[in-house]
């Protein structure tokens, strides 16, 4: 007889969840050398531990710690790339910029990147029914909680000069609702991080504001000079030659003239 | 050196299709957005189009949206601008631009042009 | 858009003097200005970008100068080469566009 299951608002877990951590885990750790002493079966019981049997609308920061834990990863200063709303540029970004790092370019944001998970209260199974979503079942759901507690660790271990890269095509450029805005602004080190420099992308040539400039971005400068961390600004007025520029730096069309 | 050389200008009767092509050399074609500009007889210049550097972004003058495309083969190092519905204004020497695009400072030149192509549109 | 207004429309002058050539906007482009050089049956030439740079290759007898809405460019001494017509062009807010020319003629 089926059981019955709670109903919720969102997609439930992605299919095949735990071979695709598992997988995942495995790739990471086999380009990564680094990493290559990290036990992916732990890092599956970890990962699971943090949710399965457990109220998806009562996950806590503490239920990944044994995660975390196994997960430690530290990124050279002056190498973090924050974003916010702009992910798939950031991430060709670091693709090509091998020496710079998005949290999915650490293990765990690298695990759990576009996947979605949670289990159910007193049971060992995993929901692939529906799943808690953020808005309108609860804020503290497995995957919110997940991003919530890596992305504070990752800006808490960051140092040097920081940046992030903003969508300048969003009617709010720096949101203080994102994780960006309610959680790595908040957590950055100000002994150890001397600078946030922003970068700013444009969506398209018709827009020549410098939207350094906007509203939003000021009330970002303020947050974090109130932190005692220096800001810096960067239109990005066209996202495709920079892309272009950093795979190939010493072309002309490259070097400042215009 | 760097060089641009248009073709497929002519004579063609009002309403009518034409095709024109812009062939590059002696530089990184898909390292800069591509223009056609275009000049009347006796007249000035007046900026027609232009392309991004992969072509994903297309702009017009207002005087030929829905009317031109532009479009680029950066395997071909090509630049492509096929006007449709021509009308007697739209008779000119037409250039192909190279534009330096630089991605942290908005707008640009044309450091390059190519010597023209003449399109006559009348009956 | 913005409207660049070229002046004087022709200007006459004899070999070896100086020709000073305006472009006023109807609006701020700041220094994003270029001046292009075009002879009869050529295409046009690149002189000066952003206001006041010379392009490669661009004689030094050639200089832009001004910001913002006016500006100017100065041939210090012209050569029986120089005598062309001259368009100045913004390329501060889309869409980029021309003046309607200076032709340089001589006296």
């Known amino acids: 007889v089926p059981r019955w299951r709670q109903q919720w608002s969102g997609s439930g877990t992605t299919s095949r969840f735990p071979e695709t951590v598992l997988a995942r885990c495995v790739k990471y750790t086999e380009v990564h050398p680094e990493m290559r002493h990290v036990d992916c079966q732990s890092v599956w019981d970890a990962f699971k531990g943090a949710f399965i049997s457990k109220y998806p609308c009562n996950i806590t920061e503490e239920d990944y710690q044994p995660l975390v834990k196994l997960g430690t990863q530290t990124v050279p200063c002056n190498k973090t790339l924050l974003w916010s709303r702009i992910k798939d540029l950031a991430h060709q970004f670091t693709q090509v910029q091998r020496d710079m790092f998005t949290l999915e370019d650490m293990l765990l944001g690298y695990l759990a990147d576009d996947l979605t998970w949670c289990g159910e209260f007193n049971t060992f199974e995993i929901n692939y029914q529906s799943c808690p979503d953020w808005r309108k079942d609860c804020s503290n759901n497995p995957v919110s909680v997940f991003w919530k507690t890596v992305s504070r660790r990752f800006a808490e271990t960051a140092c040097g000069v920081v940046h992030v890269m903003l969508n300048g095509s969003r009617s709010k450029i720096f949101d203080k609702n994102s994780t960006f805005g309610s959680v790595e602004v908040h957590n950055l080190q100000p002994e150890k991080v001397q600078a946030l420099e922003a970068w700013v992308i444009h969506g398209g040539r018709e827009d020549s504001r410098d939207l350094c400039q906007d509203p939003t971005i000021k009330e970002l400068e303020s947050i974090i000079s109130k932190r005692n961390i220096r800001f810096f600004c960067k239109n990005i007025y066209r996202p495709d030659k920079f892309l272009q520029c950093v795979k190939n730096p010493e072309d002309s069309s490259c070097l400042s003239g215009i | 050196e760097v060089q641009l050389l248009e073709s497929g200008g002519g004579l063609v009767q009002p309403g009518g299709s034409l095709r024109l092509s812009c062939a590059a050399s002696?530089?990184?074609?898909?390292?800069?957005?591509m223009s056609w500009v275009r000049q009347a007889p006796g007249k000035g210049l007046e900026w027609v189009s232009a392309?991004?550097?992969?072509?994903?972004?297309?702009y017009y003058a207002d005087s030929v949206k829905g009317r031109f495309t532009i479009s680029r083969d950066n395997s071909k190092n090509t630049l492509y601008l096929q006007m449709n519905s021509l009308r007697a204004e739209d008779t000119a020497v037409y250039y192909c631009?190279?534009?330096?695009?630089?991605?942290?400072?908005?707008?640009?030149?044309?450091?390059?042009w190519g010597q023209g192509t003449l399109v006559t549109v009348s009956s | 858009e913005i409207v660049m207004t070229q002046s004087p429309a022709t200007l006459s002058v004899s070999p070896g003097e100086r020709a000073t050539l305006s472009c006023r906007a109807s609006?701020?482009?700041?220094?994003?200005l270029a001046w292009y050089q075009q002879k009869p049956g050529q295409a046009p030439r690149l002189l000066i970008y952003?206001?006041?740079t010379r392009a490669t290759g661009i004689p030094a007898r050639f200089s832009g100068s001004g910001s913002g809405t006016e500006f100017t460019l100065t041939i210090s001494s012209l050569q029986s080469e120089d005598f062309a017509v001259y368009y100045c062009?913004?390329?501060?807010?889309?869409?980029?566009?021309f003046g309607q020319g200076t032709k340089v003629e001589i006296k």
């Open positions: 952003g206001a006041s």
């Open positions: 609006q701020s482009v700041s220094s994003n």
């Open positions: 631009a190279r534009e330096p695009v630089s991605y942290d400072y908005y707008g640009s030149y044309f450091d390059y």
């Open positions: 392309v991004s550097l992969y072509g994903d972004e297309t």
């Open positions: 062009q913004q390329y501060n807010n889309w869409p980029w566009t």
């Open positions: 002696g530089f990184t074609f898909s390292f800069y957005d």
